[in-house]
């Protein structure tokens, strides 16, 4: 179309744009490694990075693994999405006790109410169930927990109230916050979800807490405890550690309690797309050499960093991964690892005080 | 550390309107599943519960007395309040205001030390 | 209402001792029932919650039992500082009530 010329015209000259004939206009050229969020990119923020599946890019522009809810008491609320991760929340009649970014550390099933009490509030995927006294003449057994919701206000709920079955062995696993489980109750293996809605208190046992020793009545030696397959971070929060589960990828150092799973790419790959303790892409490690070495650091430093290679080892040629993006590194098996903290956070739980200390570390906060 | 604390006229006259207030600390009253009560014992005697407040504003009260007690609370200020209308000398009392913590027991684990009140002409 | 039957109101013992005290229900409260302890000129103190469990705090000499109508709490090896009034308190159903109230004497 002659008519096109002029508009062609503008992007000639101008290595950072091109022509697109299919919308006729002047597009941004997204840098390499870069893809566009739109079919005609006008500017630097239209261009994003990447992500592999079950991957997502984070605030500081990381690929950073989707959590899963692979676990048999979590559901997916919302699916791991380009720029969000998955999030996870405690099945149906389970609540959140131990609250982990964009998942949940630890779910308890919901209190069943005691015999002759009522349900004032059902419980949800966050919150436990909340009970209350019958009414007078009114015989506990309403079909379902909605049926017993209260008025709003009133003297005395007209309601009809909950069923009254006990509690059983699998109802939860944690004592009430609020006092000492006897020895009769405990044989019976009754046990109760954590219910109290507050953390402030005489001192008692927090569902988010384990000692690590015997923890005296009002000592600080405990520390929060974290479910299985994940670690307690520098903000003291319960996070996922990620998962090596793929083909490529083989575990470098293990989930801890305090750090997480750190993944690689396995031997005779290298990694390409660099993700939060693990590589979002491993490539096949080329027959020569990359055209950036990594710079030996101390592991307490959170980001790799790259400088050219010395004089006289510039490779003969310049293999490039499928996007575009050079190899991070040069070694078989070595990853990037960037900062190790996603940005994207949930609130801390409220269960332990957690602070920092020199060392970067949780310390439980005893006061 | 959880504290709360009752305070109130101290002497009244029979028919008259008396409000008392429980301020606390250490807790909120917005928090999920926290409630506050207020229960009376007139000297010597046993505990008499009055009202409960719920986080969410729902209230409950003692049949026997409801068409005198109101209720009420200013969560961002920490208080809890009960108006009895139309005292009477059987109002005579220690009040308390107690909270309530347990989402499944409904038992006290705080209360205020009390205030005593008089009604008299 | 349901009422909170307490015996006995008064009584005698030793340190060292062992004392019950119960609350006879007028009607099922199951095990929804706490129990208090109160010192002159000071507010109450809770002791048990759901008829057997434990209050935070509370020395294990101190247990609840029974449920539906009878009630017992227990005090074994009694101390100086157990002198005090214990009353129950039902919260099966509105409105909650307490018992009358057992006062700890030293012999």
């Known amino acids: 179309f002659p008519q096109d010329r002029p508009f062609e015209d503008t992007c000639h000259g101008n290595p950072s744009h091109y022509y697109d004939k299919a919308v006729r206009r002047c597009c941004y050229r997204c840098p390499m490694g870069l893809f566009p969020t739109q079919q005609c990119p006008q500017r630097p923020t239209d261009c994003r990075k990447q992500c592999e599946p079950d991957y997502y890019l984070d605030e500081a522009d990381r690929c950073t693994a989707c959590v899963t809810c692979s676990r048999d008491d979590l559901v997916e609320k919302t699916p791991c999405a380009w720029n969000s991760s998955r999030v996870c929340e405690c099945r149906p009649g389970m609540f959140c006790s131990t609250s982990a970014v964009n998942s949940c550390a630890r779910c308890f099933f919901h209190s069943v109410c005691p015999a002759g009490m009522i349900v004032k509030f059902p419980g949800t995927a966050q919150k436990n169930t909340v009970c209350e006294p019958a009414s007078p003449g009114v015989s506990p057994a309403c079909a379902s927990p909605e049926n017993c919701k209260e008025p709003s206000s009133g003297t005395i709920p007209q309601a009809k109230p909950t069923p009254v079955s006990p509690a059983t062995s699998s109802a939860s696993t944690m004592p009430v916050r609020g006092g000492t489980r006897l020895a009769q109750e405990a044989a019976s293996k009754l046990t109760r979800a954590p219910d109290s809605p507050s953390s402030v208190g005489r001192p008692s046992s927090d569902p988010g807490l384990s000692p690590t020793q015997p923890c005296p009545e009002g000592s600080g030696d405990c520390r929060k405890q974290c479910e299985p397959d994940y670690y307690l971070d520098e903000a003291g929060r319960c996070t996922a550690c990620v998962s090596c589960s793929r083909d490529d990828l083989v575990e470098k150092t293990p989930c801890a309690w305090n750090s997480s799973r750190t993944c690689e790419c396995r031997p005779g790959m290298i990694c390409a797309t660099s993700a939060t303790n693990s590589c979002a892409r491993c490539v096949p490690y080329p027959i020569c050499a990359a055209e950036t070495v990594t710079k030996p650091q101390d592991m307490a430093e959170k980001d790799t960093t790259f400088e050219a290679p010395p004089l006289g080892t510039q490779p003969d040629c310049n293999p490039t991964p499928e996007n575009g993006e050079a190899p991070a590194s040069t070694s078989p098996t070595q990853s990037l690892l960037v900062d190790s903290q996603a940005s994207k956070t949930l609130p801390i739980p409220t269960s332990a005080p957690v602070a920092l200390s020199s060392t970067g570390k949780p310390v439980l906060d005893a006061g | 550390e959880v504290t709360l604390k009752v305070s109130g006229p101290g002497i009244s006259q029979p028919s008259q309107t008396l409000s008392l207030t429980c301020s606390f600390s250490g807790f909120s009253l917005s928090t999920y599943g926290m409630g506050v009560s207020w229960i009376r014992q007139p000297s010597g005697k046993g505990l008499e519960w009055l009202a409960h407040?719920?986080?969410?504003?729902?209230?409950r009260y003692n049949p026997s007395l409801k068409s005198r007690l109101t209720i009420s609370k200013d969560t961002s200020s920490n208080q809890v309040f009960l108006k009895i209308t139309s005292v009477d000398t059987a109002d005579t009392a220690t009040y308390y205001c107690a909270r309530r913590a347990e989402l499944r027991d409904f038992y006290f684990d705080y209360w205020g030390q009390g205030t005593t009140l008089t009604v008299s002409s | 209402d349901i009422v909170m039957t307490q015996s006995p109101k008064f009584m005698s013992t030793s340190v060292g001792d062992r004392v019950s005290v119960t609350c006879k229900a007028s009607q099922n409260v199951n095990t929804n029932v706490a129990w208090y302890q109160q010192k002159p000129g000071q507010s109450p103190k809770a002791l048990i919650y759901s008829a057997s469990y434990r209050y935070s705090g509370v020395p294990d000499r101190f247990t609840g039992s029974g449920s539906g109508t009878d009630l017992t709490l227990t005090i074994i090896n009694i101390q100086s500082e157990d002198l005090a009034e214990y009353f129950c308190q039902q919260y099966n159903t509105y409105p909650l009530t307490f018992g009358v109230g057992t006062k700890l004497e030293l012999k």
């Open positions: 407040i719920y986080w969410d504003d729902d209230k």
